[in-house]
């Protein structure tokens, strides 16, 4: 889980070691702050859970691409 030590900076110290189905992901944000030990992606799931993931992993990149496309596609 992401950890906000000195709000408003949120950092990830561990990454999930499992792929999460892209269909369970609602949004993401990138963590690039120099105050954090590592770059990370925090996914928010459809049931509002937050998960730290490694941006170097292919499934994480695929998920971000998928979410980007979803937000670009206007709902009819």
């Amino acid at each position: 889980q992401p950890d906000a030590i000195n709000a408003p900076v949120t950092c990830c110290y561990n990454f999930t070691n499992r792929k999460i189905s892209v269909q369970r992901l609602a949004s993401y944000r990138r963590i690039t702050s120099s105050k954090c030990p590592k770059e990370a992606v925090i996914f928010k799931t459809i049931v509002a859970k937050e998960i730290c993931a490694d941006p170097k992993q292919k499934w994480v990149q695929d998920s971000m691409d998928h979410l980007d496309k979803q937000t670009q596609t206007p709902k009819t």
């Epitope: 792929k19 269909q23 049931v47 998960i51």
Partner: antibody, heavy 119, light 113 residues
Framework: QVQLVQSGAEVKKPGASVKVSCKVS????????MHWVRQTPGKGLEWMGG????????IYAQKFQDRVTMTEDTSTDTAYMELSSLRSEDTAVYYC????????????WGQGTLVTVSS | DIVMTQSPDSLAVSLGERATINCKSS????????????LVWYQQKPGQPPKTLIY???TRESGVPDRFSGSGSGTDFTLTISSLQAEDVGVYYC?????????FGQGTKVEIK
């Protein structure tokens, strides 16, 4: 393509334990979240538990909480489901099931393992 | 936990006739941001694992005949077999995959009248 191959049928006495295996091929086990579902004779499908990547842990149906343990051997890509203190009502077909990264539902199932509990 | 309730428990339909199965969830399985219902329909035949027919409540799995269709949103869903064939005999289950624990309906047995 994920393939799930389960261990063979078992006959157990009441009070004993059974351990069913589910071997994954086509993917590695750590890429998947394995779940277990059972079907008692003439009854419906019953979710027993499985790995929830959103919580990062294995979760169990309340009904089985005290008696079931689900484990994984990542070196052999095999998932296990152990059910203890067996009773006759546990006679059922036990399935492992998982979903592909691009889907959310169970789109891959093992062939099922019949566990018969009889004295 | 979300409770899934199917009706009827069993159904006898003549060949070529329409079969309709209902599924009700105790809370909504619709995620409004993507407008998707996290509901799947499975068909199960004796001695076989379940087979996916419909996902997202209304999207047919590839290879599934178009006589199978799914509809509904939120908490009320329907699986329709427009013209029952002999090979459609089996038990049909709905399942929600919106939130864990994923839960199944109790099943509807479809037979030929």
């Amino acid at each position: 393509q994920v393939q799930l191959v389960q261990s063979g049928a078992e006959v157990k006495k009441p009070g004993a334990s059974v351990k069913v295996s589910c071997k994954v091929s086509g993917y590695t086990l750590t890429e998947l979240s394995m779940h277990w579902v059972r079907q008692t004779p003439g009854k419906g499908l019953e979710w027993m538990g499985g790995f929830d990547p959103e919580d990062g842990e294995t979760i169990y149906a309340q009904k089985f909480q005290d008696r079931v343990t689900m484990t994984e051997d990542t070196s052999t890509d095999t998932a296990y489901m152990e059910l203890s203190s067996l009773r006759s009502e546990d006679t059922a077909v036990y399935y492992c099931a998982t979903n592909d990264f691009w889907t959310g539902y169970y789109d891959y199932w093992g062939q099922g393992t019949l566990v018969t509990v009889s004295s | 936990d979300i409770v899934m309730t199917q009706s009827p428990d069993s159904l006898a339909v003549s060949l070529g006739e329409r079969a309709t199965i209902n599924c009700k969830s105790s809370q909504s399985v619709l995620y409004s941001s993507n407008n998707k219902n996290y509901l799947v329909w499975y068909q199960q035949k004796p001695g076989q694992p379940p087979k996916t027919l419909i996902y997202w409540a209304s999207t047919r799995e590839s290879g599934v005949p178009d006589r199978f269709s799914g509809s509904g949103s939120g908490t009320d869903f329907t699986l329709t077999i427009s013209s029952l064939q002999a090979e459609d005999v089996g038990v049909y289950y709905c399942q929600q995959y919106y939130t864990s624990p994923w839960t199944f309906g109790q099943g509807t047995k479809v037979e030929i009248k």
